[in-house]
């Protein structure tokens, strides 16, 4: 539970998060377990600790080992372990299994491949994408935010995909690569006018003031992976990004699920620390594809804290 495997390539940046979480005010000390030597916090060091993060800029094969993070509150020290392995770069194109992140799958029309671990890094778009070491070119491939979109997916698109990006630390740039397998599910699909499964039209969602709340916009668009299908949230008719309330955020990236063979998308709206003024807003779940757009409206109402059990 409080031990995590991490890996990277020599001469690339690697950033590891302490698996033991604490309050933001708590300090975190990092040690190299084999020698019990403290990891420095000064950024001039190649390997240094920065709060919850341990940074290898860049990593070396000799950095491999178990690192201990100790999260300290005024009265308690709690320990986590990061098992780090740094590998030599392969001279050939083959990416060994031990460097692969989890496999993702898609089908026909389009698919998304997310770049693993990228949220830990300070990077700027665009990402570079490679398949079997070849740079991806052509209109079917689009690098968008932290994922690759492949239009009109074919069985030949299966393979190992590598994302490459630059991590910036105090003006210095470091390369990072991450690879995962992509498999293609062969299925015939069709497209329908969007059907919103949740929320119900004009639903009233009860929330507790001061607590976090999640609203899920879920819609289905037909069978098989869909082309130009999306779900999103609007606040008072305005895009979330344009609304300007940092407490209210859409989940980055849409979750794709296949329910009873149907292609469905979810988008979670996360409201942190619900305030009275949030009850006055109109929350619109929008689902759209080539057939058109459907909208369901939700409003929030206050409820008293009720019991629930983990």
């Amino acid at each position: 539970k409080f031990s995590k495997q991490s890996w990277g390539l020599e001469n690339e940046a690697l950033i590891v998060r302490c698996p033991r979480q604490g309050k933001p005010s708590y300090t975190v000390d990092w040690y190299y377990s084999q020698t019990n030597k403290s990891i420095p916090t000064q950024e001039r060091n190649r390997v240094f600790a920065s709060g919850q993060l341990l940074k290898f800029l860049p990593a070396a094969v000799a950095d491999s080992g178990i690192y201990t993070c100790i999260v300290r509150s005024p009265t308690f020290n709690r320990t986590g372990y990061a098992n780090v392995t740094i590998y030599k770069k392969q001279s050939d194109c083959n990416v060994p299994d031990y460097l692969m992140y989890s496999t993702v799958s898609g089908s026909e029309k389009n698919s998304k491949i997310y770049c693993p671990t990228i949220d830990l890094y300070n990077w700027t778009a665009p990402l570079e994408w490679f398949k079997n070491c070849q740079a991806l070119q052509g209109s079917r491939y689009r690098a968008h935010k932290s994922f690759l979109v492949i239009d009109n997916v074919m069985t030949e698109d299966a393979g190992d995909y590598t994302c490459k990006f630059i991590h910036n630390e105090n003006g210095a740039n470091y390369s990072v690569t991450a690879t995962r397998s992509f498999t293609v599910k062969d299925e015939q699909g069709f497209s329908l006018f969007p059907v919103i499964g949740a929320p119900a039209q004009n639903e009233i969602k009860e929330v507790e003031i001061g607590k976090n709340a999640n609203l899920t916009c879920s819609a289905c668009f037909g069978k098989g992976t869909q082309f130009l299908a999306a779900v999103l949230w609007q606040l008072n008719g305005t895009k979330i990004t344009d609304f300007g309330e940092p407490r209210i955020q859409q989940e980055e990236g849409q979750n794709q699920s296949f329910s009873n063979g149907l292609a469905c998308l979810d988008m979670v709206l996360r409201i942190a620390d619900v305030k009275e003024e949030d009850l006055l807003l109109q929350y619109d779940c929008l689902a759209l594809n080539l057939h058109g757009l459907r909208r369901h409206t939700v409003r929030l109402s206050r409820k008293n804290p009720i019991d629930h059990h983990s």
């Epitope: 309050k23 308690f76 976090n212 620390d273």
Partner: antibody
């Protein structure tokens, strides 16, 4: 110095209600989760209820779910336990305790406890 | 609900002897386990957290070990003030306590 002081216990008939309070001092009350634990006479400890630092997250033991309500007033540094539909088996010393680490909705140890207040449910 | 079973129910020992208390969980709790000491008429006192870490101010004669489902509290040499009831507590999934082990003077 951290201090927790429970009050509100007493004798109540079955089916009756009681409200326990726990006055906290010596720490930033709103930073920490708080928990009620009870101990029946001559018995062991039983967790009753949990509330997160901002009051937004609450959990209950199955034995009290639907009857007890935990709440807090961070402006008054006070924790509450509203107990309704009391039964004989609710007879116990009730302790409030601090969970000093808990991020909202998670659990840790109880590092400071009050001295307890006795609740007796009897006809 | 995770059930914690402590053994033995009672431990009769003399001052200076070593006490070994056991706590077994019905499923893995990783290292999310604590030990408390309770004396008559008093609230429990935290001794050990995260299975093996001593809480602030706890003497070195108290030590904890174990991970997963099997845990041990050891008192290396019993002092007169150590005779009390000891409880284990898991916090991996909500909170549950063991039924307690009474350490009494032989």
């Amino acid at each position: 110095e951290v201090q927790l002081l429970e009050s509100g216990g007493g004798l109540v008939q079955p089916g009756g209600s009681l409200r326990l309070s726990c006055a906290a001092s010596g720490f930033t009350f709103s930073d920490d989760a708080m928990i009620w634990v009870r101990q029946a006479p001559g018995k062991g400890l039983e967790w009753v209820s949990y509330i997160g630092g901002n009051g937004g997250t609450t959990y209950y033991a199955d034995s009290v779910k639907g009857r007890f309500t935990i709440s807090r007033d961070n402006s008054k540094n006070t924790l509450y336990l509203q107990m309704n539909s009391l039964r004989a088996e609710d007879t116990a010393v009730y302790y409030c305790a601090r969970d000093p680490w808990s991020t909202e909705g998670s659990f840790f140890v109880l590092d400071y406890w009050g001295q307890g207040t006795l609740v007796t449910v009897s006809s | 609900e995770i059930v914690l079973t402590q053994s033995p129910a009672t431990l009769s020992l003399s001052p200076g002897e070593r006490a070994t208390l056991s706590c077994r969980a019905s499923q893995s709790v990783d290292d999310d386990l604590a030990w408390y000491q309770q004396k008559p008429g008093q609230a429990p006192r935290l001794l050990i957290y995260d299975a093996s870490n001593r809480a602030t101010g706890i003497p070195a004669r108290f030590s904890g070990s174990g991970s997963g489902t099997d845990f041990t509290l050891t008192i290396s040499s019993l002092e007169p003030e150590d005779f009390a009831v000891y409880y284990c507590q898991q916090y991996n999934d909500a909170i549950t306590f063991g039924q307690g082990t009474k350490v009494e003077i032989k």
